[in-house]
């Protein structure tokens, strides 16, 4: 029986060009975490295997950094990064636990409005 629960950072927002940490935490189970896969709308971002370490998908290598912990850091955010992210905990013997995070990337207020104002 699956008794665990996943806590996530929930719905978060960040500015374009900035960075954000995606975090999930599995609790209330003694199951062994064998691997955590991070996905963005059915696209693999990264893998953290408990014994073998991290793998960052080639298409995200420039903008994704492993950690902290089993979390994931997204850098140089663009508005196209807005959307759902999933942490998929593969555990033994429980099975798979999935957490969801919604990220909204906002246009920077400085980038959007800064040019309209002149400093005398």
């Amino acid at each position: 029986m699956m008794t665990g629960t996943i806590e996530t950072t929930g719905n978060i927002s960040a500015e374009k060009g900035g960075s954000i940490i995606l975090q999930c935490h599995l609790s209330s189970t003694t199951a062994q975490v064998t691997q955590v896969n991070w996905e963005q709308q059915d696209q693999l971002l990264a893998i953290c295997n408990a014994d073998l370490g991290w793998h960052i998908s080639p298409s995200f290598k420039d903008r994704v950094a492993p950690g902290p912990g089993l979390g994931l850091t997204l850098q140089s955010l663009t508005v196209n990064d807005t959307g759902e992210y999933f942490c998929i905990y593969h555990t033994y013997p429980d099975g798979t636990y999935t957490g969801r995070i919604f990220l909204e990337v906002l246009e920077s207020s400085v980038a959007e409005h800064g040019a309209r104002f002149q400093i005398p």
Epitope: N37, D42, H55, S57, H90, T96
Partner: nanobody, 116 residues
Framework: EVQLVESGGGLVQAGGSLRLSCAAS????????MGWFRQAPGKEREGISL????????YYADSVKGRFTISADNAKNTVYLQMNSLKPEDTAVYYC?????????WGQGTQVTVSS
């Protein structure tokens, strides 16, 4: 769900070689990784090798690095583990596991016994 069937285990003398195979059938959704784990008596299951579906990157535990080689034949839906220079401490049940965007599927395991 993916059905995984391992083969190739057995009894071998120290210093010998074995090649494990893991054939998959069934719906695979979006394949992410194929890996090999092992579990020795009284110990936790440990990951020893992994190959990724996106670029074929391979990863190895320090205990098997330089002795074991993982490979995949996508046309046959099969992943292999070539094990050379086997040691008595490699004795364990070996499991293959595939992860997809939906979950993780395990094989039933194959026994590898290395005698000294």
């Amino acid at each position: 769900e993916v059905q995984l069937v391992e083969s190739g285990g057995g009894l071998v003398q120290a210093g010998g070689s074995l090649r494990l195979s893991c054939a998959a059938s069934g719906r695979a959704f979006s394949l992410r990784t194929m890996g090999w784990f092992r579990q020795a008596p009284g110990k936790e299951r440990e990951g020893i090798s992994l190959i990724t579906s996106d670029d074929g990157s391979t990863y190895y535990a320090d205990s098997v690095k330089g002795r074991f080689t993982i490979s995949a034949d996508n046309a046959k839906n099969t992943v292999y583990l070539q094990m050379n220079s086997l040691k008595p401490e490699d004795t364990a049940v070996y499991y293959c596991a595939w992860t997809t965007n939906r979950g993780m599927d395990w094989g039933q395991g194959t026994q590898v016994t290395v005698s000294s």
